[in-house]
């Protein structure tokens, strides 16, 4: 099993960072942290997506990876899709520290998100409370700024 | 100036191969996925193929699967379509274009090459 | 055949207000945003709209786009003669793993 894994985000532009996960038990939380650049001051969705295909750039990403079919929520929240890792803030600078703990996501099994895609998005993560059907798909983050295929670290 | 410079096309015999080339300026090539979408005369436009900005992911549309081969050399700022076993089908002006998409606002597209397949 | 489907022509005098359809289905239009290009004779296609409803800059306010479920559709309004061209609808494609377009719209300015 691997336990420790990367991703390098790109996008159009400025935006660009890496973010590294590690998880120490099969079963036991990741670890998420990094930093992402050239972002608008403020929240920013953040998301793993279905699909590790980048052929399009971020469009080809796929929706939300949602192995157990639920609606978008937070982190912290029952439902939700296990992609669904909220926001990150970028400061005035644009930068984003990333520190998240997760215990949905996994570096295997049938939650496992290597070779998937991670996305940083354009708008905040309304975390399913948006009121709109768009909310309980995206949290309606808008487009998709920057985004890499996570792989497997040493 | 921003640009994408086509070459390559041509007539060739069914069966035969033919590489295009397109040679991107201005912009930072190796930050973009990039795409080959061809038209037959007097016919619609049609995606051929797209590969991602650092090569991991190749996509190709049905039509050519196993037939044709996309890549990109980052250093040279240079994206390559290599066509085998071309069909009279095949047939089109071949575009090189920097798709709209999530991330990219502004598109670019080369002027097209002229691919005939005639025996 | 095109995955998109678009009416193959549509019409108007100058200044009148013209619509052109765009049907797809849930892996395209539904899950994805729809793109629209116009293509002027013997010329690389030129974007309209991009994200279902957002215009890049230089491209005229009669141009708008929507979206909805799925389906999408070009709306010009006060139609000019340099209007006449071809309109394609183009949007990704989760099933197929591909940039799908309509088969595309020949307008013609009466």
């Known amino acids: 099993m691997a336990t420790k894994a990367v991703c390098v985000l790109k996008g159009d532009g400025p935006v660009q960072g890496i973010i590294n996960f590690e998880q120490k038990e099969s079963n036991g939380p990741v670890k998420v942290w990094g930093s992402i650049k050239g972002l608008t001051e403020g929240l920013h969705g953040f998301h793993v997506h279905e699909f590790g295909d980048n052929t399009a750039g971020c469009t080809s990403a796929g929706p939300h990876f949602n192995p157990l079919s639920r609606k978008h929520g937070g982190p912290k929240d029952e439902e939700r899709h296990v992609g669904d890792l909220g926001n990150v803030t970028a400061d005035k600078d644009g930068v984003a520290d990333v520190s998240i703990e997760d215990s949905v996501i996994s570096l295997s099994g049938d939650h496992c998100i290597i070779g998937r895609t991670l996305v940083v998005h354009e708008k905040a993560d309304d975390l399913g409370k948006g009121g709109n059907e768009e909310s309980t798909k995206t949290g309606n983050a808008g487009s998709r700024l920057a985004c890499g295929v996570i792989g497997i670290a040493q | 100036e921003v640009q994408l410079v086509q070459s390559g096309g041509g007539l060739v015999q069914p069966g035969r191969s033919l590489r295009l080339s397109c040679a991107a300026s201005?912009?930072?090539?190796?930050?973009?996925?990039m795409h080959w979408v061809r038209q037959a005369p007097g016919k619609g436009l049609e995606w051929v193929s797209g590969i991602s900005w650092n090569s991991g992911s190749i996509g190709y549309a049905d039509s050519v699967k196993g037939r044709f081969t996309i890549s990109r050399d980052n250093v040279k700022n240079t994206l390559y379509l290599q066509m085998n076993n071309l069909r009279v089908e095949d047939t089109a002006v071949y575009y090189c274009a920097k798709l709209a998409g999530d991330i990219v606002v502004i598109p670019l597209w080369g002027p097209g090459t002229l691919v005939t397949v005639s025996s | 055949l095109p995955v998109l489907t678009q009416p193959p022509s549509a019409s108007g005098t100058p200044g009148q207000r013209v619509t052109i359809s765009c049907s797809g289905s849930s892996s395209n239009i539904g899950s994805n945003y729809v793109y629209w290009y116009q293509q002027l004779p013997g010329t690389a296609p030129k974007l309209l709209i991009f994200?279902?409803?957002q215009r890049p800059s230089g491209v005229p306010d009669r141009f708008s786009g929507s979206k909805s479920g799925t389906s999408a559709s070009l709306a010009i309004s006060g139609l000019r003669s340099d209007d006449e061209a071809d309109y394609y609808c183009?949007?990704?494609?989760?099933?197929?793993?591909?940039?799908?377009f309509g088969g595309g719209t020949k307008l013609t300015v009466l």
């Open positions: 183009v949007a990704w494609d989760d099933s197929l793993s591909a940039w799908v």
């Open positions: 201005g912009f930072p090539f190796d930050d973009y996925a």
């Open positions: 994200r279902n409803n």
